[in-house]
């Protein structure tokens, strides 16, 4: 599940938010490492209300959430974390 998502596209996020999103509102998270056309790490969150937001990777709440998800990565994740590798 925790592969790396590489892309040759430029940055996806035109603005980022630090506003906390409760986990129960989150449907999916995608992490895009820096490089390959974008100089910064990007975190994209799909919410259950059919909205999508870029989260500031420096936001404490998302760092905590990602740490929890990494620790649980051996079991079923309540929030899917997508880091698929694109050839």
């Amino acid at each position: 599940v925790l592969e790396v998502y590489y892309t040759s596209l430029r940055c996806r996020c035109v603005q980022e938010s630090s506003v906390f999103i409760p986990r129960r509102f989150i449907d999916r998270i995608q992490i895009l490492p820096r490089g390959n056309g974008c100089p910064r790490k990007e975190i994209i969150v799909w919410k259950k209300n059919k909205s999508i937001v870029c989260v500031d990777p420096q936001a404490e709440w998302i760092q905590r959430m990602m740490e929890v998800l990494r620790k649980r990565s051996s079991s079923t994740l309540p929030v899917p974390v997508f880091k698929r590798k694109i050839p």
Epitope: R12, C13, V14, Q15, S17, R28, E42, I44, W46, N49, K50, S51, I52, C54
Partner: antibody, heavy 122, light 107 residues
Framework: QVTLKESGPGILQPSQTLSLTCTFS??????????VGWIRQPSGKGLEWLAN???????YSNPSLQSRLTISKDTSNNQAFLTITNVDTADTATYYC??????????????WGQGVRVTVSS | DIQMTQSPSSMSASLGDRVTITCQAS??????LIWFQQKPGRSPRPMIY???NLANGVPSRFSGSRSGSDYSLTISSLESEDMADYHC?????????FGSGTKLEIK
């Protein structure tokens, strides 16, 4: 190449039910993040958002029409549908369907159909 | 619901003029705004997304800006092909709402 095309009755009478079909290609409503919306435009006036339906059958509609409006889809035939019951002359408009894809950057209604003109007249 | 107040409703300008159209949001929409151009007899197409970003294929004479709750579309030097209706859309929350539209004509 993404295309959408609306079809409908053209003309109908007050109190009847309007049924519209959006037939699309170039994307699938089974794909995560895909949605189709309906928007209408009375002649010479502005746009009004009516409803969205998403890949997982989640639906959102305009509260001003919610009691009369139903949105649905047929993924196997790449179609989305809109019905409005008990129509009135105020429902006379060009009706558009448009695609939305939940990707970043998110641009709702990035592709539109050509529109279908609907006239409600007695 | 979020109201989008668009002005002017119509305007006439000369070729080469700088033209600005504004939408004011009744609540904070945090740049969740798109500008659509609709040429006569055609469907709308997105020109500006997230308030300030140019969509693919849009000429650089178009730009978007924000000042508080006011969102503006500016054409730096009007060309004849810019004659169209322009609509703003907020997509911060449902129900999505459009401005009332601006008809831009060439003098």
């Amino acid at each position: 190449q993404v295309t959408l095309k609306e079809s409908g009755p053209g003309i109908l009478q007050p109190s009847q039910t309007l049924s519209l079909t959006c037939t699309f290609s170039g994307f699938s409503l089974t794909t995560y993040g895909m949605g189709v919306g309906w928007i209408r435009q009375p002649s010479g006036k502005g746009l009004e958002w009516l409803a969205n339906i998403w890949w997982d059958d989640d639906k959102y509609s305009n509260p001003s029409l919610q009691s009369r409006l139903t949105i649905s889809k047929d993924t196997s035939n790449n179609q989305a549908f809109l019905t409005i019951t008990n129509v009135d002359t105020a429902d006379t408009a060009t009706y558009y369907c448009a695609r939305s894809e939940l990707v970043m950057p998110y641009v709702p209604f990035d592709y539109w159909g050509q529109g279908v003109r609907v006239t409600v007249s007695s | 619901d979020i109201q989008m107040t668009q002005s002017p409703s119509s305007m006439s300008a000369s070729l080469g003029d700088r033209v600005t159209i504004t939408c004011q949001a009744s609540q904070d929409i945090d740049n969740h705004l798109i500008w659509f151009q609709q040429k006569p007899g055609r469907s709308p197409r997105p020109m500006i997304y997230y308030a300030t970003n140019l969509a693919n294929g849009v000429p650089s004479r178009f730009s978007g800006s924000r000042s508080g709750s006011d969102y503006s579309l500016t054409i730096s030097s009007l060309e004849s092909e810019d004659m169209a209706d322009y609509h703003c859309l907020q997509f911060k929350q449902y129900p999505f709402t459009f401005g009332s539209g601006t008809k831009l004509e060439i003098k």
